[in-house]
Amino acid sequence: APTSSSTKKTQLQLEHLLLDLQMILNGINNYKNPKLTRMLTFKFYMPKKATELKHLQCLEEELKPLEEVLNLAQSKNFHLRPRDLISNINVIVLELKGSETTFMCEYADETATIVEFLNRWITFCQSIISTLT
């Protein structure tokens, strides 16, 4: 059974992930971002279901395409280089989902824009955090 300390750690990691995803979304939605139109043409894949930490596998698998799209944006829109930002997210995701179980992600048929993709994972983080508090 999860201890209060492990629950607290999970909550902090989720909050960190949430902040990183929100920072990316804010950088993209920044009214000064001339790349928004181009960024919105890129397709992202969404999980059929995302209710548990193991479903973060679906986020992990789309981090490289996310980095590619962020490479289009001026680095001043973000505090970190896309490579460093995605690397940080990857570390948190790996810790949260755990490496013991191998989960095969199932994707929805419809693709999403980067904004829809980020909003979906922001909602996921918020939902899990609310169950922990």
């Epitope: 980095e67 590619e68 992600c105």
Partner: antibody
Framework: EIQLQQSGPELRRPGSSVKLSCKAS????????IHWVRHRPEHGLEWIGW????????RYAQKFQSKATLTADTSSNAAYMQLSSLTPEDTATYFC??????????????WGQGTLVTVSS | DIVMTQSPFSLAVSEGEMVTINCKSS????????????LAWYQQKPGQSPKLLIY???TGQSGVPDRFIGSGSGTDFTLTISDVQAEDLADYYC?????????FGAGTKLELK
């Protein structure tokens, strides 16, 4: 028809610079990134970098960071690459290229005919 | 950067033969979301620009003869040319475009025996 028309061959002395052009037709240059690729027969193909003509933003492969400067002029629907501090190693054919569609930056489907740059004293 | 190891370096063939060119990447090029491998194959003839033959590892570019077949997934890829024609004599390159910077294989020269 989508075409990328490049400038003619160039002969340069070591230490000098050269500016190559790539004029796009059949589409609006601001809709796609323009990539530049180097071909040396003994080294194959190497990606140099890209420019987004819409706002002039660029990305370079690390080894070309201080060698190449990419620019674009939307009014003439053209992209340019300046190569500085030329050495005989820069002798190569340089290509500009565009991706297959706008939903992803690669692969390169449309290519210019190439510009041969020869660096010799 | 992803390293693309292409083999063989050169290949001498007779017309009508079948040839295979291999490309191995240092990391997987498969995107799970769409089950596509971000790998392309190019043909380059002397004095010409490279021509896109195959993208997403196995999708033939419009107008490319169907004797050019791309296969493979993950890290191992193959370009097969069945019934080689004289006009197929050229250099062939693989390109990964999964992770920036995009990187090419060293190339394979297809020559006539």
């Amino acid at each position: 028809e989508i075409q990328l028309q490049q400038s003619g061959p160039e002969l340069r002395r070591p230490g000098s610079s050269v500016k190559l052009s790539c004029k796009a037709s059949g589409y609006n240059i601001t809709d796609y990134l323009i990539h530049w690729v180097r071909h040396r027969p003994e080294h194959g193909l190497e990606w140099i970098g890209w420019i987004d003509p819409e706002d002039g933003e660029t990305r370079y492969a690390q080894k070309f960071q201080s060698k190449a400067t990419l620019t674009a002029d939307t009014s003439s629907n053209a992209a340019y690459m300046q190569l500085s501090s030329l050495t005989p190693e820069d002798t190569a054919t340089y290509f500009c290229a565009r991706s297959l569609d706008s939903t992803y930056n690669y692969p390169f489907a449309y290519w210019g005919q190439g510009t041969l740059v020869t660096v010799s004293s | 950067d992803i390293v693309m190891t292409q083999s063989p370096f050169s290949l001498a063939v007779s017309e009508g033969e079948m040839v295979t060119i291999n490309c191995k990447s240092s990391q997987s090029l498969l995107r799970s979301g769409n089950q596509k491998n971000y790998l392309a194959w190019y043909q380059q003839k002397p004095g010409q620009s490279p021509k896109l033959l195959i993208y997403y590892a196995s999708t033939g570019q419009s107008g490319v003869p169907d004797r050019f077949i791309g296969s493979g997934s993950g890290t191992d890829f193959t370009l097969t040319i069945s019934d080689v024609q004289a006009e197929d004599l050229a250099d062939y390159y693989c390109l990964q475009h999964w992770i920036s910077p995009p990187t090419f294989g060293a190339g394979t020269k297809l020559e006539l025996k």
